[in-house]
Structure formats: structure tokens, C-alpha cells
Interface confidence: low
Amino acid sequence: VGSGMGTGQRAGSPAAGPPLQPREPLSYSRLQRKSLAVDFVVPSLFRVYARDLLLPPSSSELKAGRPEARGSLALDCAPLLRLLGPAPGVSWTAGSPAPAEARTLSRVLKGGSVRKLRRAKQLVLELGEEAILEGCVGPPGEAAVGLLQFNLSELFSWWIRQGEGRLRIRLMPEKKASEVGREGRLSAAIRASQPRLLFQIFGTGHSSLESPTNMPSPSPDYFTWNLTWIMKDSFPFLSHRSRYGLECSFDFPCELEYSPPLHDLRNQSWSWRRIPSEEASQMDLLDGPGAERSKEMPRGSFLLLNTSADSKHTILSPWMRSSSEHCTLAVSVHRHLQPSGRYIAQLLPHNEAAREILLMPTPGKHGWTVLQGRIGRPDNPFRVALEYISSGNRSLSAVDFFALKNCSEGTSPGSKMALQSSFTCWNGTVLQLGQACDFHQDCAQGEDESQMCRKLPVGFYCNFEDGFCGWTQGTLSPHTPQWQVRTLKDARFQDHQDHALLLSTTDVPASESATVTSATFPAPIKSSPCELRMSWLIRGVLRGNVSLVLVENKTGKEQGRMVWHVAAYEGLSLWQWMVLPLLDVSDRFWLQMVAWWGQGSRAIVAFDNISISLDCYLTISGEDKILQNTA
């Protein structure tokens, strides 16, 4: 995206502005720049499953009836415009909300090219002041918009059909020399604008659609379906430094907040102030001879705090997440400078009360002390506040670094990206994807149970109308009881005239068992809200039990676990609906219905309308587990 000008030099800003800030280093380190980015990573498995489940090979369908794919990256304009401040040609001030009709308007900027993505294995979108103006404000006289979008349709369509590997899109502040802290502020504004990746795959009928939101009213022979995904951070406020830990030695601007704010040139009655050690050695800050003074000061810059009587000053970390018990706050303070004050650290978890962190002092060299506090692994994202409470007429304190260390264990604990999926009905009603293809009509015209579901691979969506749908039995002798697919044509089953998977447990002298095994299903996406749905019925007296076993193919070894069980049942001849969460399934798997019965058993066991939720393969929860408060 185009390179924007520095905010201090934007056309139309007053000539006599504040003095120019010192420049920040031209090249942030790779890690620092990385930490300013918002990364969207769509796993390769999503592409594989979307292709297998939704996109049949091109030869099997007419060109006109082929599903289409679209994509975009959207950001709310308001936080981005607030960063720029009032600008000429903006019809509403950045501080106030956009007018209602403008909020849904969006301006679309060109995204990246397939060529770039193929070459770099990732698409980097740089967002600067000019792009914000172009995308959110536009030419003078045009209404301001509420949404800035990058068009990624070409790219997503190529990736989903022909691409390989994962799709990685990095959104980051445009890199250029400007005033101190610009990239950090731009990064914060980008995160506040809740960037989200939008994908859409929709099936078309006999004519290609212009717009997926402008569907023609469907006729009975017209088939269409529309799936949408939004990938966004489950905690958009979460600092991306969270992935790498936070280490701030005050040599460069940090992602910390200060209260009262960090000193600037216009505010001479400073509290927090970033000063280089050379300057400290020239200032009359410490008692004792100059030689000692320079020896005590660390190299580089540090924070100096000048406080009046009984005041409170705070340094606040960005939002973080920890995946390690060993996550620790470490702060280096100068102990001789603050005899009349004390430091307190607070853990501020999201949606929970604040609590104090036990600070353990470790004396260091030349009067510096490292205060360490164990943070551990709070369930929720958190911030850490370091408060200096002075108690005396005047107090001086120095901080050399502020770090959150060892907060990640194994995979990055950074922001958790969720890929939320939905199914849009013809009338505009939006369902969760899990509601599609579950044998319950949720759309007014039933399109959520339509052709898309019947085209899923064998076993995913089975009402046994076309046979066993991949369910098989071992080699059977003529006298072995068998599972069968047939109708329940019987006066007692007026409500269920279609086919089902049945087993008759007729009276036998010795115990009997019968097993039927499903087709094999791929491994669900990690942390997807995966479910198995089915209806079941037992009519008559079952002297025995029926189990549903999930078998995982773990590195060649088969591991079975019972996921459902019913025993010694006197059936009511009523169909019952069952939804089973398939948790912690990490390998390909299949299902087995195992019935066992003994003497005196005269029951019919029936299963029908079996479906594996599309969520298993096309949805990613932002959280590995449900958030809960800890004591």
C-alpha cells in the first residue's frame, strides 16, 4: 500500500506545530517490526478441507455452477482516523462516530497479487497515513466511510483452489522515518481497528452471481449456498509482543503506557522521563562524587521519575497472554534513588479483579535492584501495572528495564485468531456453520440442508436413503445378527417412514454382539467446535447395551474410546436426538456402533440422520478452552 507522509507534515497542518520529535531509528529490528504486525495465518488444513468438502473437481461441474470464492481484509476507520487527527475533507471528526449511513459504507483498496504471494509465501500489507486517507476519507466531497477494505478475492480464490501450504497475511504499519513512536502508535491504531479477514465461498446455480449478498429469489430448481468466514483476534486488544515477551530497556520507544504521561518537551514539570545515561551523569541527580555517579548509571537510556509528595505513578504493560507457569515480571530499579517510596506490581487480568504480584528483590550491581514477580499462566489476557508510590516531600526513582519474560511455552501464546464460520440463508438469515447439514432445517426454505450437504464426502451426512453411506460390517455368517438399512414400516413408526440403520436383537440362547463401522473421517482442525449428531431409537426390551466407539488411528495404532452408551433399556419407541462433542480428536478417526445382548432381549436398535459437523473442518475457535476465572 502506498507510502504515507509523516503525520507531522501532513498537508494542511499548521506551520507552527510542536517542535519536531527526535527521529526513531530507521530500521527497527526484525523482531521489533514483527511485534508491530497483525498476522493472519489460515492453516493449510483449512484449505485442504474447504477444497475437499466444498469445491468438487472442476470437470465435475459446469463452469457456471462452480462455487466461487471471495476474500477481503477489513478495518474499522474510526481508530485509524483518530490517529491522524482532524484532516481536510473529512466530513466527520475522527473523535466522533461516523453517521449511521456511513458506518456500513466501505472503500476497497487493492490487496496483494497472487504472484507476490507465490513468491514470498506470505502477503504483507503495509498501512500508512496515505492509505488510511485514501481508504477511509477518499476524495473531497465524498462521504467518509466506516470501513477500510483490501480486496483479496483473487488471492483467496487462487489459494483455496490451487495454493499450497498455509495462507499468511501480515498487516503492519508502513515503514518510514518519522517521529518517535509513530510505528508503535500506528500499530496500536491498527489493532484497535479490529482487523479481520473475510472469506466467502458460495455455490451458484445456473447463472453466475454478481454479488453474493444480492441473491436472486430462488426457484425450486435453483440451488445456491453461501458460507462466510471471519478470522479475527479473539482478543483484539492483545499485544502482539505477547508472542515474543516484552523487554523494554527504554533505549527505543516501548509499548508501555505511563501515568502521568511520559514527559515531552512542552511539559517541563516532568514525572516519567526517558533520559540517556550521559545526560544523567551531567544532571545533579545523585548524591556522591561524579565518578561514582557515572559508574552507577547503566549504558543507554533509562526512565527517571521525579515525584512530589504522596503521589502515585504507573507504568502499564500492553495486553499480554502467558502459556507458561514461569512467566515473570522483571523490573530493574535504582534503590538508592528511592528511599522514601516503594514499588507495587499489579496483575490486571481481563474481566477479573486486579491483584498484587509478589515482588522479590535481587540486588544487582552499583545500586540497581531487580524486582521479580511470578505471573504464571493466568487464564485470561492481562496487563501488568508497576506503581511507584512516593511518601515524602520529593522523591527520585530510576527504572532501567521492564520485562515480561518466559511467558511462552512451545507454541506462541500471542493473540488467538479465531476463524468464525457462518451459513447465510437466501432470506439473509445468518446461521452458525454448525447448523448447516445437521438434518434440522434452520433456513426458511431449507437450503441449509440442501445440495451442498448431499455433496459432502461419504459418511458426513447420512440419512441412509441411498444405502449404508460407508458403514460396513465384517464378514458375516448366515446366522450372525446383522445391521441393516431398511424402513421402519410399522404402525408404531408412523412418524418415521424413511430408511434407518437397524439391528434386531431377537431372543438368543447365548449372548450375541454386532458391530458396524463408519467410513474414515479426517482429523478435525485443532480446537474446532467439532460435533457428531445422530438420532437413535430402541424399541422393545434390550437386555444388553449399545455403545458408540470413536477409534483414532494414532501413528498406526488404533485407540478406541466410548463416546456414548446405553444399557438395559426398555425402549419407548421414540426417536431421540443426540449431539456429541468430539473433543481432543487429533488423528483421522472412524466410528463403531457396538451392540451386545443376551437372553430375553427383544429390541430393535435404530440409528439415523448421522452427521459430522462442518465446524470440525471449517471453523477454528480462538480459545483452546473456554475462558474461566481463576481463584
Epitope: 507457569e325 512467566c327 507495587i344 496483575l347 477479573e352 479483579a353 486486579a354 491483584r355 498484587e356 509478589l358 522479590m360 528483590p361 535481587t362 521479580q372 511470578r374 505471573i375 504464571g376 499462566r377 493466568p378 487464564d379 476465572n629 481463576t630 481463584a631
Partner: antibody, heavy 120, light 106 residues
């Protein structure tokens, strides 16, 4: 079973020092802080301080700075508290108690207590 | 330091009674309030943490409630084994501080 076993009762002279011990078993010693609490009829329960056995870091209640010194030996899963310059004020029961590092403000298991008598 | 005021300092009740002990903090402690039981032999056990959560192995007749600065412990159906002194403790700010205790007699 999880246990915090404290050393037996002590009788010491005023001005002397004493070291109380608390041996942990049934859990990973370095996964929990060890806290020490004093109980007197006058002041009730008072928090003395805590040690992080993993790092050896300590934190003290200002009231007990200089009075108590906390240490821990990872190899024997034992926490120690040395009490210095003893007076009759230091004569009650001392408890060790463990606390989870994060997400918890409670002491979930306590030792049985050690009675200290300071008398000439 | 946060002051914890516990009331009453002692109370007498009959078996089967419902008993409530109160604890007031000198400032908002954000639900970081724990209750302990000290038996006559000196043994101390955690009963309730984070205002209302029962520690493992504690009978369900014990319950806790409250918010801000006001908290309470309730024993719904008093049993002989509940004869003890009960303490509240705040864990919101350092140093952790305890209430003066409530001696429960049958």
C-alpha cells in the same frame, strides 16, 4: 499424601536465634511459594513473608524485616525460617503454608505449626 | 495494610443450626477473600477461596458469599466436627492480612 511437616517445639533464650523448618512432600516443591505466618493471642494471624523455592527470591512483611530470614533447599524440599534477636514477643506458634504462584490468593495447605518459647 | 474486621469474635450454636460469620475489609479486595478453619489442636485448613469456591474435600454445607468490602461464611447444618475457630484472609494486596477469628462453640 500432601504434607507440610514442621520441626518440633523450641525453647530458646532471649537474644538468641532459632531456625524453624518445614519439609514438603506429595507435590513439586518448586511449583509453590512457601509462606510463613505467625499466630499470637494478641495479634492473631500475621503474615511474615514468602519464599519462591525455584529462584530463592523472598518477600517480607515490613514488620518482620530483619527479624525473619527465609531460605529454601530444593534438594530436600525444605523451607527454613531463621528468627533473630528473640524476645518474649516472638513466643507464639509459627505456621508454614504453601500458595500457588498465580491466580490464587489462598494458602491451600498448612503445616501443623511450631511452638516457640522464648524464656530465660 | 488492608484491615480485616471479623464478627462476631465468638458464637454459640446448636447442632443443625445455620451459622453466618462476617468479614469486612478496609478497602475493596475484589473477591480475593479466603476462609480457614483452625481446629482446637491448631490444625489449619482452607475451606473457601475466592469468596465462594469450595476447596477440595470441604463439605458442601460450607458456603461463602460477598463482594467489594463485605463477605460472609455460612455453615448451613452445623455438625459436631465444625467446632473450631474460623478466619478470613484477604489476598488482594500485600501483605496478606487475616481477620481476628470467630470461635464457634456448640
Amino acid at each position: 499424601a500432601l504434607q507440610l511437616q514442621q520441626s518440633g517445639a523450641e525453647l530458646v533464650r532471649p537474644g538468641a536465634s532459632v531456625t524453624l523448618s518445614c519439609k514438603a512432600s506429595g507435590y513439586t516443591f518448586t511449583d509453590y511459594e512457601m509462606h510463613w505466618v505467625k499466630q499470637t493471642p494478641v495479634h492473631g494471624l500475621e503474615w511474615i513473608g514468602a519464599i519462591d523455592p525455584e529462584t530463592g527470591g523472598t518477600a517480607y512483611n515490613q514488620k518482620f524485616e530483619g527479624k525473619a530470614i527465609l531460605t529454601a533447599d530444593k534438594s530436600s524440599s525444605t523451607a527454613y525460617m531463621e528468627l533473630r534477636s528473640l524476645t518474649s514477643e516472638d513466643s507464639p506458634v509459627y505456621y508454614c503454608a504453601r500458595r500457588r504462584y498465580y491466580g490464587s490468593s489462598s494458602f491451600d495447605y498448612w503445616g501443623q505449626g511450631t511452638t516457640l518459647t522464648v524464656s530465660s | 495494610d488492608v484491615q480485616m474486621i471479623q464478627t462476631p469474635s465468638s458464637l454459640s450454636a446448636s447442632l443443625g443450626d445455620r451459622v453466618t460469620i462476617s468479614c469486612r475489609a478496609s478497602q475493596d479486595i475484589g473477591n480475593y477473600l479466603n476462609w480457614y478453619q483452625q481446629k482446637p489442636d491448631g490444625t489449619v485448613k482452607l475451606l473457601i477461596y475466592y469468596t465462594s469456591r469450595l476447596h477440595s474435600g470441604v463439605p458442601s454445607r460450607f458456603s461463602g458469599s460477598g463482594s467489594g468490602t463485605e463477605y460472609s461464611l455460612t455453615i448451613s447444618n452445623l455438625e459436631q466436627e465444625d467446632i473450631a475457630t474460623y478466619f478470613c484472609q484477604q489476598g488482594s494486596a500485600l501483605p496478606p492480612t487475616f481477620g481476628g477469628g470467630t470461635k464457634l462453640e456448640i
